[in-house]
Interface confidence: low
């Protein structure tokens, strides 16, 4: 057994939140404040995310799991593991780069992120528009004039909108 | 430690192009963002754009749009930055500089500086 | 794009001083500002973050304080170490921008 071990890699018996230190003869040392390894057999320790400036601290860093940020008030997180913070706008708004704009007449944003999508367009569907939109919320589409007859079905939801992506910053 | 290493001092004829590297070492390449800031002989500091590599894309400065190309290799930790057109002006020590998180954000780590020399 | 003026452009002290830096954004940037150090042929050193914190490692005899418009650096004892080039900056929005800087030299 022993000596099928020490055949072995020696780091491979380090385990997360620690690494293995070249510099003491491949000893596992544990990482040092502000670094982690979240697996074992780690020749180095990686340096903790640090949430700062439009970032806050939502996890905190361990020594075997890096520190997970979220954004602070009137900010959103785009990206993996919120790698970015992008502004809140209102909704009727979108984030362009020169800040939050009203959205065009004819177009609509009904969340605080996200870019303005264009009303549908009920008469694609051969209906008629119910109730007019605004910036803040689609078109409501009714049936066609031509079902307006007794027994006539009642209003449909607009056609789900497009994903909503995010301007560039 | 993270480490920031920029490749060495150029000299450039008006009108031609620069490509200046940034290779990191020391932490996770991918999920910071990348800016460059220059600084003319005796002046300030200025940021020209920057990326996240985990994404690929850039954002520019609007001085700089169009003249100025960002970019990393993943897989070397290596960001990029290309000036094209260059004139007299451009001469500047060029930095990379990393964010902890995104962009906008503070500047915790600097590479060491490539000096650019535009000259005819 | 936000403008940050800092005053005054030179300052001379001496050792033991009490030296404050004033930087001013043309629009309020909350408090999304930090200080940085420069030594001549180096890079900038981050001092302080979202206008009063500490970065990791920097001495205590730098203070940073201000929201808004108007932010301040203080140096509470000038050190020989701390002849240099102070720049702030904001990162309420892009692009993130520098004031012009500050230069610190002995009296």
């Known amino acids: 057994f022993e000596r099928t071990r020490s055949l072995q890699d020696p780091c491979s018996n380090c385990p997360a939140g620690t690494f293995c230190d070249n510099n003491r003869n491949q000893i596992c040392s544990p990482c040092p404040p502000n670094s982690f390894s979240s697996a074992g057999g780690q020749r180095t320790c990686d340096i903790c995310r640090q949430c700062k400036g439009v970032f806050r601290t939502r996890k905190e860093c361990s020594s075997t799991s890096n520190a997970e940020c979220d954004c602070t008030p009137g900010f959103h997180c785009l990206g993996a593991g919120c790698s970015m913070c992008e502004q809140d706008c209102k909704q009727g708004q979108e984030l362009t780069k020169k800040g939050c704009k009203d959205c065009c007449f004819g177009t609509f944003n009904d969340q605080k992120r996200g870019i303005c999508r264009p009303w549908t367009n009920c008469s694609l569907d051969g209906k008629s528009v119910l109730v007019n939109g605004t910036k803040e919320r689609d078109v409501v589409c009714g049936p066609s004039p031509a079902d307006l007859s007794p027994g006539a079905s009642s209003v449909t939801p607009p056609a789900p909108a497009r994903e909503p992506g995010h301007s560039p910053q | 430690q993270v480490q920031l290493v920029q490749s060495g001092a150029e000299v450039k004829k008006p009108g031609s192009s620069v490509k200046v590297s940034c290779k990191a070492s020391?932490?996770?390449?991918?999920?910071?963002?990348i800016s460059w800031v220059r600084q003319a002989p005796g002046q300030g500091l200025e940021w020209m754009g920057g990326i996240i590599p985990i994404f690929g894309t850039a954002n520019y400065a609007q001085k700089f749009q169009g003249r100025v190309t960002i970019t990393a290799d993943k897989s070397t930790s290596t960001a990029y930055m290309e000036l094209s057109s260059l004139r007299s002006e451009d001469t500047a020590v060029y930095y990379c500089a990393r964010s902890s998180g995104a962009y906008p954000g503070y500047f915790d780590y600097w590479g060491q500086g490539t000096t650019v020399t535009v000259s005819s | 794009d936000i403008q940050m003026t800092q005053s005054p452009s030179t300052l001379s002290a001496s050792v033991g001083d009490r030296v404050t830096i004033t930087c001013r954004a043309s629009?309020?940037?909350?408090?999304?500002l930090a200080w940085y150090q420069q030594k001549p042929g180096k890079a900038p050193k981050l001092l302080i973050y979202d206008a009063s914190s500490l970065e990791s490692g920097v001495p205590s005899r730098f203070s940073g304080s201000g929201s808004g418009t108007e932010f301040t650096l203080t140096i509470s004892s000038l050190q020989p170490d701390d002849f240099a080039t102070y720049y702030c900056?904001?990162?309420?929005?892009?692009?993130?921008?520098f004031g012009q800087g500050t230069k610190v030299e002995i009296k």
């Open positions: 900056q904001q990162v309420n929005s892009y692009p993130q921008t």
């Open positions: 020391g932490g996770t390449f991918s999920s910071y963002a």
């Open positions: 629009q309020s940037i909350s408090s999304w």
